[in-house]
């Protein structure tokens, strides 16, 4: 799981180091990469690689950078204005409806179906019925029913591009 510790859990001295850059708020808000001071007079910069803010805000602290889970690869690091971007490892995917974890892609389609879409970091392989062309519902077939592209090999490895 991604770290659930938020900035409230940190001691005040850990949140705002004295060397952080300060500027003045605009209409009560601070720009991306900053948070507002408790007295509302200053914008304090986030700490690179530790926390961030992506929009104009009145946050009393920047948001904690996400750490990629095991089973994920880091596509881009956390900056002061952008959170870490994590992606499922090759052979696994994350569905929008279940974003909590990466799931293994199926290795092949059930008998009577053909593969029309590869495993990607955001989708399982896609199977359709040979005759009708209708999509498979997504249940994992029994092992003996699985048709792989060649014995013992996955139908398609995941690509990290895209």
């Amino acid at each position: 799981e991604s770290a659930l510790i938020t900035q409230q859990d940190l001691a005040p001295q850990q949140r705002a180091a004295p060397q952080q850059k300060r500027s003045s708020p605009s209409e009560g808000l601070c720009p991306p990469g900053h948070h507002i001071s408790e007295d509302g007079r200053d914008c304090i910069s986030c700490k690179y690689g530790q926390d961030y803010s992506t929009h104009w805000n009145d946050l009393l602290f920047c948001l904690r950078c996400t750490r990629c889970d095991s089973g994920e690869v880091e596509l881009s690091p956390c900056t002061t204005t952008r959170n870490t971007v994590c992606q499922c490892e090759e052979g696994t995917f994350r569905e929008e409806d279940s974003p909590e974890m990466c799931r293994k892609c199926r290795t092949g389609c059930p008998r009577g179906m053909v593969k029309v879409g590869d495993c990607t970091p955001w989708s399982d392989i896609e199977c359709v019925h040979k005759e009708s062309g209708t999509k498979h519902s997504g249940e994992v077939p029994a092992v003996e029913e699985t048709v792989t592209s060649s014995p013992g090999t996955p139908a398609s490895p995941c690509s990290l591009s895209g």
């Epitope: 799981e1 991604s2 659930l4 938020t6 992506t54 929009h55 805000n57 009145d58 946050l59 009393l60 602290f61 948001l63 904690r64 929008e96 409806d97 974003p99 909590e100």
Partner: nanobody, 126 residues
Framework: EVQLLESGGGEVQPGGSLRLSCAAS????????VGWFRQAPGKEREFVSA????????YYAESVKGRFTISKDNAKRTLYLQMSSLRAEDTAVYYC???????????????????WGQGTLVTVKP
């Protein structure tokens, strides 16, 4: 089942004000960040503002900075968007949304939100 119901939209002249409300049926409203998005005719849905779960600290899109204020009443399970100095370009259907993940801190992209209201139309014209 998550239900979000927006209200408060209407027609207003440029420079005018409106206050949108969003009532939530879900008990986790009080422990979740919530966001406002909008969609103008022929355009993609865009982020407007989002507020942290406890109702302190928020994000605003550059285009609404200083004009819109988001707030949240956890006891009433209601989200608000106070809109002032309205412009023609603010004309859109406004949606409130809850994130897919309960542990999200302050999401600000459409794909991070999984539960949407039906929207309320705001029209700004002379």
């Amino acid at each position: 089942e998550v239900q979000l119901l927006e209200s408060g939209g209407g027609e207003v002249q440029p420079g005018g004000s409106l206050r949108l409300s969003c009532a939530a049926s879900v008990s986790t409203f009080g422990t979740s960040p919530v966001g406002w998005f909008r969609q103008a005719p022929g355009k993609e849905r865009e982020f407007v503002s989002a507020i942290r779960w406890e109702g302190v600290g928020a994000y605003y899109a550059e285009s609404v900075k200083g004009r819109f204020t988001i707030s949240k009443d956890n006891a009433k399970r209601t989200l608000y968007l106070q809109m002032s100095s309205l412009r023609a370009e603010d004309t859109a259907v406004y949606y409130c949304a809850l994130p897919r993940r309960g542990d999200a801190e302050l999401p600000s992209t459409v794909k991070e939100y999984g539960y949407w209201g039906q929207g309320t139309l705001v029209t700004v014209k002379p």
